[in-house]
């Protein structure tokens, strides 16, 4: 091993801040990868790693591309994957990851699944089905053309599966209410049996959600199939078409046939022999966990190792299991001593924000966030033009129809609790993703489902309902939701994206950049209404004034939460208004504030906590 000029941290309670995220993985997976990467070093040295939410962290983690604000620009795909600086102040100790890479768990793109029997677990690539290996979603075994994947390595053994994002399941944006494509459909007198970019100048693939676009003018955008979008070849950016014909043989997944280098490829039309259109299939990507563990080694003071089996060797190779070699362990223990973690005391200075107050403090719970959604950031820019926004018809009809053979069919299209996890009883939910008062009812969101709580006698609780059935295009996991009391528009936030619904018509996703929020704002914890079309927008201990009409924050207005709301947890993960009170949720608890619903006073009169309680027992009235 080698160390870096003898540099090391002078304390053993290391703090880190995840400043921004890659779109390649869900945010909770990124959080987990970084936490596991730190834990690798904490296992063998007396170090603890605490996540904080500001630039005062020892190790600031950032995704960037090309020139990204330091003297060491990234280089596009492959080559340099990431870099880190040795321990010290400022940029020293920070770790930067090249977002031109495909970040994965080391085994290919991470594809969320829908329906099936795996509760939305991501696809496992490669997987075995009927003795064959698949490295992308497939339509094999089905007669309805809906792509699916196994969520374990062996479908034949485990039988666990889900459906991949597909226009046969749903569409995004547009005015088709999220319904699946109807194939074939008529557009400008011509019949289309697949998504098309015809009539658009922006390259977005769309389809009609009825059999005749010319007549009905109903359409949606087709989800991007990241597992099947090719690179290189002569069709970069196009989708694999399965099945395709090559040298007279039919292929239902990517193949290396015809190549000496073993690289997987596919045709982008149904017949390679006639059309000669092809590209390389997405690669396995780089394990964010492994690369992060290597970079964090640097950030702790380790230089490269000359031992090829060591994590600190300067070449990436994917491996499973505990990644440290004896050389890595010797190096970190040389710097920080033997043994594992010290007493798990919090670091002396984590952040400047106040800590949560009673009830008993809990570890900060980070609201889980959504899989990245794809599609235009604003409404459609050309033909097909949007249809009328009034009287929306019911949401999508749900799961694809069953095929005659394996894999098994998806669940019923009715709102059902069969595939809901955790249990269908909201009283069993520890922490909800988001809570909001919408149309007079308190809505509790969790993992793509929601319950409605109507505050009256009888059966006050309804649900669960599929979120995407009511609000098509929303991701499975939300950070917060808010209904504008004046216009009744509903705002949803997930990660750095926002969707705004007027009835069933959606605008979005829009990036938080468009709201005037910088990259350090990684999610929105909630909004509270003010008068005159204004609201307060919250994110991790800070609050901005937000104009609901222009959908912009006033950047000069940002203050610390405790300046306006004394005694609430600074890191509340969900904030909402209910019956004219403001609620700040942290873990299982809420802090209720008698909220002065008016424009900020000059002296920032502080709103006082008047109650602290349990979300389930006190709000949901669970037994």
């Amino acid at each position: 091993f080698q160390t870096f000029k003898g540099l090391k941290w002078d304390h053993h309670n290391i703090t880190y801040w995840i400043q921004n995220y890659s779109e390649d993985l869900p945010r909770d997976m990124i959080d987990d990868a970084f936490a596991r990467a730190f834990a690798v070093w904490g296992e063998v040295a007396p170090l603890t790693f605490t996540r904080v939410y500001g630039p005062e962290a020892d190790i600031v983690i950032q995704f960037g591309v090309a020139e990204h604000g330091d003297g060491y620009p990234f280089d596009g795909k492959d080559g340099l994957l990431a870099h880190a600086f040795p321990p010290g102040a400022g940029v020293q100790g920070d770790a930067h990851f090249d977002d031109d890479e495909l970040w994965s768990l080391g085994k290919g793109v991470v594809i969320p699944t829908y329906y099936g029997n795996s509760n939305g677990a991501p696809c496992h690539f490669p997987f075995t089905f009927e003795g064959r290996s698949y490295s992308a979603c497939t339509t094999d075994g089905r007669n309805d053309g809906t792509p699916w994947c196994s969520t374990t390595a062996d479908y034949d053994k485990d039988g666990k599966f889900g459906f991949c994002p597909s226009e046969r399941l749903y569409t995004e944006h547009g005015n088709g209410e999220g319904k699946p494509c109807v194939f074939p459909f008529i557009f400008e007198g011509r019949s289309y049996s697949a998504c098309t970019t015809k009539g658009r100048s922006d390259g977005y693939r769309w389809c009609a959600t009825t059999a005749n676009y010319d007549q009905d003018k109903l359409y949606g955008f087709c989800p991007t199939r990241v597992d099947a979008t090719v690179v290189g070849g002569n069709s970069a950016g196009e989708l694999c078409v399965f099945p395709f014909v090559f040298l007279g043989k039919q292929y239902s997944s990517c193949t290396s046939d015809g190549r000496r280098d073993g690289r997987l490829w596919c045709a982008t039309t149904s017949n390679f022999d006639t059309d000669k259109k092809w590209g390389f299939c997405p690669d396995q990507g780089y394990s964010l966990f492994l690369v992060a563990a290597h970079e964090f080694g640097h950030a702790l003071g380790l230089d490269h190792s000359s031992v090829p089996e060591a994590l600190m060797y300067p070449l990436y190779s994917y491996l499973e299991g505990f990644p440290l070699n004896k050389d890595d362990i010797d190096g970190i223990q040389y710097l920080y001593g033997r043994g594992s973690k010290p007493d798990p005391r919090p670091p002396a200075t984590t952040t400047t924000e106040p800590q949560p107050t009673a009830p008993p403090t809990m570890c900060p719970t980070i609201p889980p966030t959504a899989y990245p959604t794809v599609g235009p950031t604003v409404g459609p820019t050309g033909a097909p033009s949007p249809g009328p926004t009034s009287s929306p018809s019911p949401g999508p009809t749900g799961a694809p129809s069953p095929g005659p053979t394996a894999p098994p069919t998806a669940g019923s299209s009715e709102a059902s609790t069969e595939s809901l996890s955790p249990a269908d009883n909201p009283c069993n939910v520890d922490v909800f993703d988001a809570i909001a008062e919408i149309q007079g009812a308190l809505h509790f969101f969790k993992d793509g489902w929601y319950w409605k709580f109507l505050n009256h006698r009888g059966s006050p609780l309804q649900g669960p309902f599929l979120t995407a059935r009511t609000w098509p295009a929303l991701p499975a996991t939300l950070d917060s939701a808010f209904e504008d009391p004046q216009t009744k528009r509903v705002f949803f936030f997930s990660g750095r994206q926002m969707w705004v619904y007027t009835g069933k018509t959606v605008l979005g996703p829009r990036s938080l950049d468009k709201l005037g929020l910088g990259p350090e704002v990684t999610h929105v914890s909630g909004l509270l209404p003010r008068r005159l079309g204004k609201a307060l927008l919250f994110s991790k201990g800070r609050v901005w004034r937000f104009d609901l009409k222009s959908q912009k924050v006033d950047p000069q207005s940002v203050i610390r939460v405790d300046k306006e709301f004394s005694g609430v947890p600074w890191n509340s993960h969900d904030i909402f208004q209910y019956q004219d009170k403001a609620y700040f949720c942290h873990g299982k608890f809420f802090w209720r504030v008698s909220f002065q619903n008016e424009v900020n006073k000059v002296d920032h009169e502080v709103n006082q906590v008047d109650d602290v309680g349990y979300v389930t027992y006190d709000l949901l009235q669970c037994p």
Epitope: F4, K5, D70, G71, D75, G79, H83, A84, D303, P314
Partner: antibody, heavy 124, light 107 residues
């Protein structure tokens, strides 16, 4: 002992081309980022181009972008600079330099070894 | 691009004296600064990296200090072989840039 040895300089007419080489020895060449830095007669130092250790990524000063191409052959421990459309203002001693940093550990700053330089004169 | 300004342009001192060379960056570059010595007809030679670390084989009379925007190279007691041109170079932001140089000459 680390050594960098440039070659390929000479007199060339404006609009002409030259290919400079830098033979490296005494260190694991493939691990390090490599640079070309030039110095016009009587003037200061100016960076020209860098190629990262992996060989793919390259960066260029605005003054040479589109005309010069840096490359490396890790199997031959050699760095190259292909110079096309040469101009009078490209006249300089061209040095190849080894970055003290390598790969993804970017705390180091400085070029710890330099070649002796090769003179490129662009004149009609 | 970050501008690196060295002062003075020329410094005339006698052997045994203390030399102080200054380098100022137009914006903060943390400690990403290197100093080089160049003698006529020779390639530059790395003296100091990361503002304050002496490169291999560099005598202890050479020292570097500073961070942010202001940096200093100090030669505690000048030796005859120290008369040369000295350049600073930053890598706190892209692209890297060099100062225009300070000529250290015998008084």
């Amino acid at each position: 002992e680390v050594q960098l040895l440039e070659s390929g300089g000479g007199l060339v007419q404006p609009g002409g081309s030259l290919r400079l080489s830098c033979a490296a020895s005494g260190f694991t060449f493939s691990w390090y980022d490599m640079w070309w830095v030039r110095q016009a007669p009587g003037k200061g130092l100016e960076w020209v181009s860098v190629i990262y250790s992996s060989g793919g990524p390259t960066f260029y000063a605005d003054s040479v972008k589109g005309r010069f191409t840096i490359s490396r052959d890790n199997s031959k421990n050699t760095l190259y600079l292909q110079m096309n459309s040469l101009r009078a203002e490209d006249t300089a001693v061209y040095y190849c330099a080894k970055d003290r940093a390598y790969g993804d550990y970017v705390g180091w700053n400085g070029f710890d070894y330099w070649g002796q330089g090769t003179l490129v004169t662009v004149s009609s | 691009d970050i501008q690196m300004t060295q002062s003075p342009a020329t410094l005339s001192l006698s052997p045994g004296e203390r030399a102080t060379l200054s380098c100022r960056a137009s914006q903060s570059i943390s400690s990403f600064l290197a100093w080089y010595q160049q003698k006529p007809g020779q390639a530059p030679r790395l003296l100091i990296y990361d503002a304050s670390y002496r490169a291999t084989g560099i005598p202890a009379r050479f020292s570097g200090s500073g961070s942010g925007t202001d940096f200093t190279l100090t030669i505690s007691s000048l030796e005859p072989e120290d008369y040369a041109v000295y350049y600073c170079q930053q890598r706190g932001n892209w692209p890297i840039t060099f100062g225009q140089g300070t000529r250290l000459e015998i008084k």
